[in-house]
């Protein structure tokens, strides 16, 4: 006999929630795998800056995305299937996974806060790297897309360390159009904006992390309530 009333409502809420979670995981995994195997991105990964090899931030970032996507799909599936099948075993596993993910998020948050300067440095290096690839090999559309994403997201263009050749390309091709950035190229320094993001705007990342944590706690509660409901309904 299935669950009834409020518990039934929780069952479908958990199903819908985790189906969306599973889909999002699939999208992230797909994009990450495409980035990993796309030849132009591979060029970016093996790019050298001067006599120094490129930072492995991007490489690590792609593998983190693959892991995040896979975990999201797995956890989403557990929640989805566990809810619709009313399986205590699957819901118990789902709950355990959420506890582990919650612990990972807290650990990642602490690590990120402690290492924010290094992360900011790596992000700046990655931006420089993408910019170099976009100028030298202008067929590298991924590199251009990365640069444009930086520019549009952070509302910046270039950095004070640029060469004249890069500046020419930025002014004419890679700066956000229709903005006053081109005339204030070095005032809207992307390196400065990245630093600001990791210091002044850290609270935004914190809020995002708290929102994710609250959703996780909410899902944990729902899965436990549903689990108890299933147990109780099987008693009668």
């Amino acid at each position: 006999m299935g669950v009834e009333g409020c518990t039934k409502c929780i069952k479908y809420l958990l199903f819908v929630f985790n189906f969306v979670f599973w889909l999002a995981g699939g999208v992230i995994l797909g994009v990450a795998l495409w980035l990993r195997h796309d030849p132009q991105t591979t060029n970016l990964l093996y790019l050298e800056l001067g006599d120094k090899p490129a930072p492995n931030t991007f490489y690590v970032g792609i593998y983190i995305l693959i892991a995040v996507g896979a975990v999201m799909m797995f956890v989403g599936f557990l929640g989805c299937y566990g809810a619709i099948q009313e399986s205590q075993c699957l819901l118990g596993t789902f709950f355990t996974c959420l506890v582990i993910l919650f612990a990972c998020e807290v650990a990642a948050g602490i690590w990120g806060f402690v290492n924010k300067d290094q992360i900011a440095k790596d992000v700046k290096q990655f931006y420089d790297q993408a910019l170099q690839q976009a100028v030298v090999d202008d067929d590298a559309n991924n590199a251009k897309a990365v640069v444009k994403t930086f520019h549009e997201t952070l509302d910046c263009c270039g950095s004070s360390t640029l060469t004249a050749l890069t500046t020419s390309v930025l002014k004419n091709n890679l700066c956000p159009s229709g903005s006053n950035i081109i005339s204030n190229l070095f005032k809207e320094d992307c390196h400065k904006k990245i630093d600001e993001l990791f210091s002044g705007k850290l609270y935004l990342i914190g809020i995002a992390a708290i929102v994710v944590a609250v959703i996780m706690i909410f899902e944990m509660i729902l899965s436990m309530v549903l689990c108890c409901g299933i147990r109780n309904s099987s008693v009668y």
Partner: antibody, heavy 123, light 110 residues
Amino acid sequence: EVQLLESGGGLVQPGGSLRLSCAASGFTLGSYWMSWVRQVPGKGLEWVSSISSSSSYIYYADSVKGRFTISRDNSKNTLYLQMNSLRAEDTAVYYCARQRIGDLVVHYGLDVWGQGTLVTVSS
Amino acid sequence: QSVLTQPPSASGTPGQRVTISCSGSSSNLGSNTVNWYQQLPGTAPKLLIYGNSNRPSGVPDRFSGSKSGTTASLAISGLRSEDEADYYCEVWDSDSYVTFGGGTKLTVLG
């Protein structure tokens, strides 16, 4: 041997058109930015235009903007300069040159030059 | 009128050291690397020095380049008769792109 060979020069009337070609050998044209530079006989060098490896970024000197068009066909290993609305002051030897870009996108000059082709604009 | 200023002429006797200057502004020479070219009579220019002071392979070490502030210099030591040519400095400027100096005609005397 790395070489550039220009062709297409000649005598043309003012207002006329001419298309210069530059064939590359000994290297893959598609891996390099390329430029056209001109020199009035007995005078100094004047940069005309530059084009990036896949034609995404193109630059012109103010004196030729709107009249000249730089292009390339990487499959044919050839660089072009289409010259329209030619004037007497465009009379010069036109050189095509390979642009050298160093680490961290530093412009390291024009490291390979063709022998040049003479364009004479006269009525 | 070039934005990079070179002396129109320079001269020296064989074995002597000759220096050719190239002066610009903070927006071109001051913030970018300079390249030097040699153009022998009746031939195409040849890259002599790139990135302020680097020599391409095949260029004798008698040729050296340096830059200080908004002035670049090309030095030729142990001058030879075959060094008689026109010399040009050049930079990539972010606004006017490839910019050449007016050129210096080097004459080897005697």
